[in-house]
């Protein structure tokens, strides 16, 4: 007799891991034999989809590999024409293994800042993140965290946050656990003991002392007055991350002795400083006005303008001289890279010389003004046009700082080298001849001035600027 | 009463070809998934391949696919398994099995007598 | 494949013993396995089938259980006539495969 279908085996939720086998079993009594079809969340499952497996009329439906895509509702439906089609449903579950996908990696970080280790995790059910940092479990405080993506934050790095973290996940089906990483806790170089300034006799020996710390242990280099240290003995102990520097000295002169902590961050250096004044009993003090020092330049952008070896004088009126000196040239030469080319090497020497003046090292260090002719020179023959314009834009306030103003000397109130040839510098590097001159293109309607003397010539020339003079 | 029996077995050298064949009575042949299980010499049970009733699903032990062909004859209540480059490691005796949906998946419920196929050089 | 270990590969004991043999499947099969009995020379025949059903005409000194990925099958009360192989077979897949059987041997 005829029967209506009836499903006496209903489908149940199945559990599977990811490439494992799932099996739906959809049960069905009927006369004549009934038709099954399957459904995945109410989509027609395609029978002939080699991912599945049909077995005895469809009764069993197998997911032969399953997928993370494969979790859903399914559903068969059983019809022999006879009577309603019946239907039962089950879900499948697709469970996975806890897995690392976005494992932690070594991290270099500097105190204080906020570190964050990632770990991303993959599973179902959801796995739940732990850390070990060395053989313990990490516990967590107001500090340190473990995110609810797994990943460990830490805020305010301290040094003892370093060492051996891996991340570990967890569910019902196993554990993963992540490769061990290095938290390293960098330190920005600090000065523990800085050197002691000394008012001595003439002749004497001073140590002078520094210790320093970071992560890495910094190194230590003394500056005099601005320059390396050329004489005196040097002695360096390093112990538990501490560097002691000794500065051994025979005084001869008054000096501003400076200790310079320097560690190295990734591609950034912190440095820390910390200075010592030696004075000399009875010692002349220096002009109210020249308040400075002689030293060798060593910046970049005059480089090519100074002579090799060029002693210079620092003002101590800026905090670090070298520095506050080398900026505004850098400025200056900044807005030379408009002019023409006549006028620019002439220009850069002059500012080069006038920022950075010839110092007289005697015993009060003295800057040496460059000579008026050479700043009209540079001002009337071969920036004139240049001139102009920018005393222009001066009056009519149209440069974004004053700092330029410093940059260009006023030729007038500068020694003529006629009063006094030792009283101002000369420049040597620009070079010409009088008998040259009318080869010149006219740059200025009106005649200099003032009558430019014979330059002295340069003996050595690094680029040719015209055929009349050149410049280095 | 549910009867199978096998047919075909003998000595082949490796290399060479061999049909079995299972004959079916009893039961509705064409209704039922048809299945060969094989044991070597002193060895345990192992499934070699199943067809369904209508030869729609059929189904190869990883090991074994390419090499051996199953096959049925509905009209004539016959099942084979056709057996090509033979080797000495196919030397074992061939169960012709009828498979039947249990109360949870399948079980073989009826086994025939055994087919011994001996492979040697 | 699901693999099926079953162990142990053979045991002796004493008529009227209680007799238990283990199969592990390598993941979750549900119920769907079955028990088989070898006497030799002879074919397989079917005793347990979706884990614990017991087929008509076997004795009911023989039953089944599951628990997780692990199936038993006990003896309770050895017979001499039960010497013989046992195996499991899993149907979740279709790639059936059967555990490597336990020898049942009388004292």
């Known amino acids: 007799l005829p029967k209506a279908p009836v499903i006496t085996t209903p489908l149940e939720t199945v559990d599977a891991l990811v490439e494992e086998v799932a099996t739906f079993m959809c049960a069905v009594e009927s006369y004549p034999q009934p038709e099954i079809s399957w459904t995945r969340n109410k989509i027609l499952i395609k029978l002939f989809d080699t991912r599945y497996s049909i077995r005895e009329n469809g009764q069993l439906l197998t997911i032969l590999s399953v997928e993370d895509s494969d979790d859903g509702i399914y559903c068969c439906t059983a019809n022999n024409g006879v009577g309603g089609a019946v239907e039962s449903c089950g879900a499948l579950q697709v469970k996975m293994k806890p897995k690392i996908t976005r494992p932690p990696i070594n991290v270099k970080i500097i105190e204080g800042l906020k570190a964050v280790l990632p770990c991303t995790t993959m599973g179902n059910p959801k796995p739940s993140v732990s850390w070990i940092k060395g053989d313990s479990p990490l516990r967590e405080n107001s500090r340190i965290a473990v995110l609810e993506s797994g990943s460990l934050r830490i805020h305010n790095v301290q040094k003892e946050d370093a060492g051996q973290y891996r991340c570990v996940a967890k569910n019902s089906l196993g554990t993963a656990y992540s490769k061990v990483v290095k938290l390293e806790v960098e330190v920005f170089a600090r000065i523990l003991r800085a050197p002691e300034s000394h008012n001595v006799t003439f002749g004497s020996f001073v140590t002078l002392h520094c210790t320093a710390t970071g992560i890495p242990v910094p190194t230590i280099t003394w500056i005099e007055n601005g320059n390396a240290v050329s004489s005196g003995s040097i002695q360096e102990s390093v112990k538990d991350r501490v560097i002691d520097s000794r500065l051994q000295l025979f005084i001869t002169k008054p000096g501003l002795y400076t200790c310079i902590a320097t560690n190295k961050h990734g591609e950034k250096f912190s440095t820390a400083k910390a200075a010592a004044t030696i004075s000399i009993a009875e010692w002349s003090k220096p002009q109210k006005d020249n308040k400075g020092y002689c030293a060798q330049y060593r910046g970049e952008v005059c480089n090519a303008v100074l002579a090799k070896d060029a002693l210079v004088f620092l003002n101590t009126s800026y905090a670090d001289p070298e520095e506050a000196q080398e900026l505004l040239v850098h400025t200056a030469w900044n807005e030379l890279k408009v002019v023409s080319p006549v006028c620019r090497p002439a220009a850069e020497a002059l500012l080069c010389n006038h920022i950075f003046q010839e110092c007289s090292p005697g015993v009060v260090p003295t800057p040496i003004p460059i000579c008026r002719e050479y700043c009209l020179a540079v001002k009337e023959l071969f920036c004139a046009k240049e001139w102009l314009v920018m005393e222009e834009k001066t009056h009519r306030g149209l440069y974004r700082s004053e700092m330029h103003l410093l940059s260009v000397p006023e030729c007038s109130k500068l020694p003529s080298m006629h009063w006094d040839p030792t009283a101002c510098a000369r420049l040597p590097h620009l070079d010409y001849n009088k008998e040259n001159l009318k080869t010149f293109p006219p740059m200025t309607s009106s005649k200099p001035s003032v009558d430019i003397p014979n330059l002295p010539s340069s003996s050595s020339s690094s680029f040719s600027v015209s055929p009349t003079y050149s410049m280095t | 009463e549910d009867l199978l029996v096998e047919s075909g077995g003998g000595l082949v050298k490796p290399g060479q070809s061999l049909t079995l064949s299972c004959a079916a009575s009893g039961f509705d042949f064409s209704a039922s998934t048809m299945a060969w299980v094989r044991q070597a010499p002193g060895k345990g049970l192992e499934w070699v391949a199943s067809?369904?009733?209508?030869?729609?699903?059929?189904y190869y032990a990883d090991s074994l696919k390419g090499r051996f062909t199953l096959s049925r004859d509905n009209a004539r209540n016959s099942f084979f398994l056709e057996m090509n480059s033979l080797r000495a490691e196919d030397t074992a005796v061939y169960y012709c099995?009828?498979?039947?949906?249990?109360?949870?998946?399948?079980?073989?419920?009826?086994w025939g007598q055994g087919s011994l196929v001996a492979v040697s050089s | 494949d699901i693999h099926m270990t079953q162990s142990p590969s053979s045991l002796s004991s004493s008529v009227g013993d209680r007799v238990t043999m283990t199969c592990r499947a390598s993941?979750?099969?549900?119920?769907?396995v079955n028990w088989y009995q070898q006497k030799p020379g002879r074919a397989p025949t079917l005793l347990i089938s979706a884990a614990s059903t017991l087929q008509s005409g076997v004795p009911s000194r023989f039953s089944g259980s599951a628990s997780g990925t692990d199936f038993t099958l006990t003896i309770s009360g050895l017979q001499p006539e039960d010497s013989a192989i046992y195996y499991c077979?899993?149907?979740?897949?279709?790639?059936?495969?059967f555990g490597q059987g336990t020898k049942v041997e009388i004292k």
């Open positions: 099995a009828r498979e039947r949906l249990l109360r949870l998946g399948v079980g073989f419920d009826s």
């Open positions: 067809v369904s009733g209508d030869s729609h699903h059929i």
């Open positions: 077979q899993q149907s979740y897949s279709p790639l059936y495969t």
């Open positions: 993941q979750r099969i549900s119920g769907f």
